[in-house]
């Protein structure tokens, strides 16, 4: 996708719908590209990205990529079309409303990626599959 500061004029007159026939509209996502992160050994983290962008295309979803190597930890937040691979991986969880991190095999680093389809869902990245934000105790942890 194109970052907000260099977005081009696009006009796709086709109405984009999901599998249930619901209209898809450009999503709101955190979009800070790659930033250094302090997120480590936690069940969930906030992105600490202050930029919320309207994605360029209605079919795009929010993506977060967490990477750790010997030197640093980074978190990448973007919009991306799930029909296209990202970092050579398919966005298999793009329909999820939450960004549930899945580990991917990358030599020389620990690499987690998630994608999701609710507004700004890549702001809260979740590493524990059992994690459920309907649990009020966990909500207190996140939003304090």
């Amino acid at each position: 996708t194109i970052p907000p500061h260099v977005q081009k004029s696009v006009n796709n007159d086709m109405i984009v719908t999901d599998n249930n026939g619901a209209v898809k509209f450009p999503q709101l996502c955190k979009f800070c590209d790659v930033r250094f992160s302090t997120c480590d050994n936690q069940k969930s983290c906030m992105s600490n990205c202050s930029i919320t962008s309207i994605c360029e295309k209605p079919q795009e979803v929010c993506v977060a990529v967490w990477r750790k190597n010997d030197e640093n930890i980074t978190l990448e937040t973007v919009c991306h079309d799930p029909k296209l691979p990202y970092h050579d991986f398919i966005l298999e969880d793009a329909a999820s409303p939450k960004c549930i991190m899945k580990e991917k095999k990358k030599p020389g680093e620990t690499f987690f990626m998630c994608s999701c389809s609710s507004d700004e869902c890549n702001d809260n990245i979740i590493f524990s599959e059992e994690y459920n934000t309907s649990n009020p105790d966990l909500l207190l942890v996140i939003f304090q």
């Epitope: 907000p4 709101l28 309207i54 409303p97 389809s117 507004d119 700004e120 702001d123």
Partner: antibody
């Protein structure tokens, strides 16, 4: 297609309360930030407030003139957005629009008149 | 709050004219600017988002440009259905704020 239909507007005395509803259809309501925007007669557009998705805690934000008097809630099971307006003032008189936050879909608006 | 100032507040133009409306932000908003069109008694309609991205279904005679504090909405060849009021809105920070509007009238 996407539809946003507001209801609940009407005439109310200063200091009174009113609850507006917005019934949404044609899109995945639970995934979307929603906003209320108002327009006083013959005036420009004024953002009232927003509610984020339940997935991210359903946080709300408000414009300064309504903060502490208005609340926004959502019922994702009913695809409905609400605006609870308390301690209404004459300057709250306006057409109130329900909108898909920062994007193209708006309701037709419902008129709220605050007058004695 | 970020103040948005539109100019002119109104203009008269003829069908076929090229029309330019400007919007200035009180501080830099990067490209976080939307343009809306509103006709009397109707809800606003989004034309342009992210300063230059044309909303689906909007005719290509509408275009947007600018970044930072200065933005422009251009209608390359005014059509009868374009006579309306146009608003800019910043989405850079909360609260999102609108310009006061520019009314485009028939000359």
């Amino acid at each position: 297609q996407v539809q946003l239909v507001e209801s609940g507007g009407g005439l109310v005395e200063p200091g009174g309360s009113l609850r507006l509803s917005c019934a949404a259809s044609g899109f995945t309501f639970a995934n979307a930030w929603m906003s209320w925007v108002r327009q006083a007669p013959g005036k420009g557009l004024e953002w009232v407030g927003r509610i984020k998705t339940t997935y991210s805690g359903g946080a709300t934000e408000f414009a300064a003139p309504v903060k502490g008097r208005f609340t926004i809630s959502r019922d994702d099971s009913k695809n409905t957005l609400y605006l609870q307006m308390n301690s209404l003032k004459t300057e709250d008189t306006a057409v109130y629009y329900c909108t898909l936050d920062l994007r193209t879909y708006w309701g037709q608006g419902t008129l709220v008149t605050v007058s004695s | 709050d970020i103040q948005m100032t539109q100019s002119p507040s109104s203009l008269s133009a003829s069908v076929g004219d090229r029309v330019t409306i400007t919007c200035r932000a009180s501080q830099s908003i990067s490209s976080y600017l939307n343009w809306y069109q509103q006709k009397p008694g109707k809800a606003p309609k989004l034309l342009i988002y992210a300063a230059s991205s044309l909303q689906s279904g909007v005719p290509s005679r509408f275009s947007g440009s600018g970044s930072g504090t200065d933005f422009t909405l251009t209608i390359s060849s005014l059509q009868p259905e374009d006579f309306a009021t146009y608003y800019c809105q910043q989405s850079y920070s909360t609260p999102p704020t609108f310009g006061q509007g520019t009314k485009v009238e028939i000359k």
